[in-house]
């Protein structure tokens, strides 16, 4: 079919000419104003320069408008997270405007063509914002713009565009090909709103990242360490979501970002959290579970202004569904070690028993290796509120039985065949709720037993020398 | 009220071009995807694709590329529905059929059908 | 392409009995906890009206006697009681956000 778009990003119907003169040029954005939570309901159009379709349709002026803003589509149709977002606009601000920007015509192209519609469409909704503003009551301050994929590109290239700067930009998996390592004026950046909040849920080192790898934000938020996001996984996918392929392994991490903001808005009462760190990595170890000098943030529609930062990279652990919240603690274990434990890592398992619920056996991630008479600390994670801490169990896992492990145990065994076994000697262990900031120690409880060897367990209660416990918590910490 | 009304049956011959109209009324027709469906007889339902009735942008199903082309007449409230170098196996009858853009993609209102026969 | 499965392709149910018609999708047609299937009704001569969307959901101006049920990849359509104007061709439909959709073969029903 004959491409139906102008120079100036405008919309010609060459399909069909009653008249060979005629040509009917219509604008390439549309701005539907949802009226209602139906997501069948056709909701209002609005243009520029028509009052008469805000009138009908309540728009109110003094209220938060969102503008949500589509990525680029194979497909050509709203996929079902728009209405899920809808809804959920809806139901947490009441008396919002939720306005869904399409741009469907120059998004249904090939990803260079699009991306290079993107600036068209963020002038758009600038000319729209601008137009409201010429309003009363109307505040630019009131306007949140959510773009998701090469839609958050669009949302700043408005908030470039727009006369004033708009309250705030969410970036919901920013779109990475053709940005990463862009200009600040070529792709979403922290100047293109008063805040501007990302959560990157696609992000790869090797191969194409989806979503953009580089914090462009004043909060970068990065869930899972950005990339593999749990519940998305091939297997998970043949189960659950329609087609099975890695297509859809790309699109549910991709778009767990846009679920992500929904649990935010819906499940209110289960604010996940992000911890500011400089790398996956040193999150993954544990290192990151401060929220001292505004370290910490709500994610999504909950997160707090923080003006002050520029990207700042955050991140937390989630569920694989809604709600996503998970629990974080980070264990310091001073390990002492009176036997060669030779090259093998040890496959470490900690259960927590809590006031409210016990555990799992959760294993304790080794980002790099075990140091052996020093603290090593550790992440770890549970699905459910286990109240204040009672005990834990630490189980050392027999040997796994990979064929590197098994030459490895018969290589110490022929160098020490007197003394095969190995031992490490945990007298203690400190324990930081990042959701609490509280901090509580641990010890054996016979201080006489505290080695442990593979395939054994070892107990710990709260020390009986009076157990850490700082009140001092973060501002938003109080708000769980 | 709601109303999607096709143009009335057509015989052609293989090889022939036939063009199929579904007239829109009681609501905004560029604020709802317009599909088609082909119902061979004794046959069921099979998708053909559809079409973006602001943009004009058509989508067709695999085993509808080529011979079919999906237009509209927007300021008429018409879409259409081409059907090129006829073969035997066209005999059907068409269906279109809109859909929300915003919601769940179901197909709410249908039109009454056209039936083509085509015949040698 | 999702293919779906009826069963059975025609059924004789009694009138004021219950009838049951099954739809399985070749993969699940479930998004964040909705299931995009929809069921339709075609009488002769007639072009198909919508009776359930999102598995679940009564279309305008249908008698309750109609449910649907389901998800994932197996979908139930339930008339309950049955009466003399249900005689009819039903055909489940999936609506997942990336076409092709498609629908079921179809299931006949007769009143004895």
């Known amino acids: 079919s004959p491409v139906p778009f102008g120079p100036e990003g405008r919309l010609e119907d060459k399909l069909h000419k009653p008249k060979a003169t005629q040509t009917e040029v219509k604008p390439s954005v549309r701005f539907n104003l949802r009226t209602s939570k139906d997501p069948e309901h056709e909701g209002c159009y609005l243009s520029v320069g028509h009052s008469q379709p805000l009138e009908d349709c309540s728009f109110n002026m003094t209220a938060k408008t969102f503008f949500i803003i589509h990525g680029w589509t194979m497909s050509g149709i709203f996929e079902n997270w728009l209405h899920k977002l809808v809804s959920a606009l809806h139901t947490r601000e009441k008396d919002a405007n939720v306005v869904v920007v399409d741009w469907l015509p120059l998004a249904h192209q090939l990803y260079t063509d699009a991306v290079n519609n993107t600036r068209v469409v963020g002038h758009s909704i600038a000319r729209m914002l601008d137009w409201l503003q010429e309003k009363d009551d109307f505040s630019l301050g009131n306007v949140h713009l959510i773009g998701y994929s090469l839609g958050a590109h669009v949302a700043g290239y408005a908030g470039n565009f727009v006369k004033g700067t708009v309250g705030r930009i969410t970036g919901l998996d920013p779109a990475g090909p053709m940005f990463e390592g862009a200009d600040i004026h070529k792709r979403l950046s922290p100047d293109d709103a008063d805040f501007v909040d990302v959560l990157h849920t696609y992000t790869r080192s090797f191969g194409l990242s989806i979503g953009i790898q580089m914090p462009v934000g004043h909060i970068d938020i990065y869930p899972n360490g950005g990339d593999f996001q749990p519940g998305c996984g091939l297997n998970d996918v043949l189960g659950s979501i329609a087609y099975g392929t890695i297509t859809e392994v790309v699109k549910c991490e991709h778009e767990r970002a846009v679920h992500l903001f929904v649990d935010s808005l819906v499940n209110q009462d289960k604010p996940s959290f992000a911890f500011q760190c400089t790398d996956s990595n040193r999150f993954k170890k544990g290192i990151c579970l401060s929220c001292r000098k505004n370290r910490c943030n709500n994610i999504g529609y909950n997160a707090k202004k923080m003006r002050k930062k520029r990207n700042s990279k955050m991140y937390l652990k989630t569920r694989a569904g809604m709600p996503f919240k998970v629990y974080h603690y980070q264990l310091k274990v001073h390990m002492f070690s009176y036997n060669n434990s030779g090259d093998t890592q040890p496959t470490l398992y900690i259960t927590l028993y809590g006031s409210n619920a016990d555990s799992q056996n959760l294993p304790l991630e080794i980002v790099e290796k075990i140091e052996l008479n020093a603290t090593n600390t550790f992440l770890v994670y549970t699905e459910e509120d286990l109240g204040d801490l009672l005990k834990m169990r630490l189980t050392w896992e027999g040997v796994a039985h990979s064929w590197y492990n098994l030459w490895n145990e018969f290589r110490n065994y022929l160098s020490q065949p007197s003394n095969p076994s190995r031992e490490l000697y945990i007298r203690r262990i400190r324990v930081k709720s990042g959701e609490t900031q509280r901090k509580v120690t641990f010890c054996t409880q016979d201080p006489t037993k505290s080695s442990i060897s593979p395939g054994q367990e070892l107990w710990f209660h709260k020390c009986q020398d009076g157990w850490k416990m700082k009140n001092k918590t973060s501002p938003f910490v109080n708000l769980a | 009220q709601i109303q999607l009304v096709q143009s009335g049956p057509e015989l052609k011959k293989p090889g022939e071009t036939v063009k199929i109209s579904c007239k829109a009324s009681g609501y905004t027709f560029t604020n709802y995807g317009m599909n088609w469906v082909k119902q061979a007889p004794g046959k069921d339902l099979k998708w053909m694709g559809w079409i973006n009735t602001y943009s004009g942008v058509p989508t067709y199903a695999d085993d509808f590329k080529g011979r079919f082309a999906f237009s509209l007449e927007t300021s008429a409230s018409t879409a259409y529905l081409q059907i090129n170098n006829l073969k035997n196996e066209d005999t059907a009858t068409y269906f279109c059929?809109?859909?929300?853009?915003?919601?769940?993609?179901?197909?709410?209102?249908w039109g009454q059908g056209t039936t083509l026969t085509v015949s040698s | 392409d999702i293919v779906l499965t009826q069963s059975p392709a025609s059924l004789a149910v009694s009138l004021g009995q219950r009838a049951t018609i099954s739809c399985k999708a070749s993969q699940s047609v479930d998004y964040d906890g909705d299931s995009y299937m929809n069921w339709y009704q075609q009488k002769p001569g007639q072009p198909p009206q919508l009776l359930i969307y999102a598995a679940s959901n009564l279309g305008s101006g249908i008698p309750a006697r109609f449910s649907g049920s389901g998800s994932g990849t197996d979908f139930t359509l339930n008339i309950h009681p049955v009466e003399e104007e249900d005689a009819a061709t039903y055909y489940c439909h999936q609506s997942t956000d990336d076409p092709p959709w498609t629908f079921g073969g179809g299931t006949k029903l007769e009143i004895k």
């Open positions: 059929a809109r859909f929300s853009y915003y919601g769940r993609h179901y197909f709410d209102y």
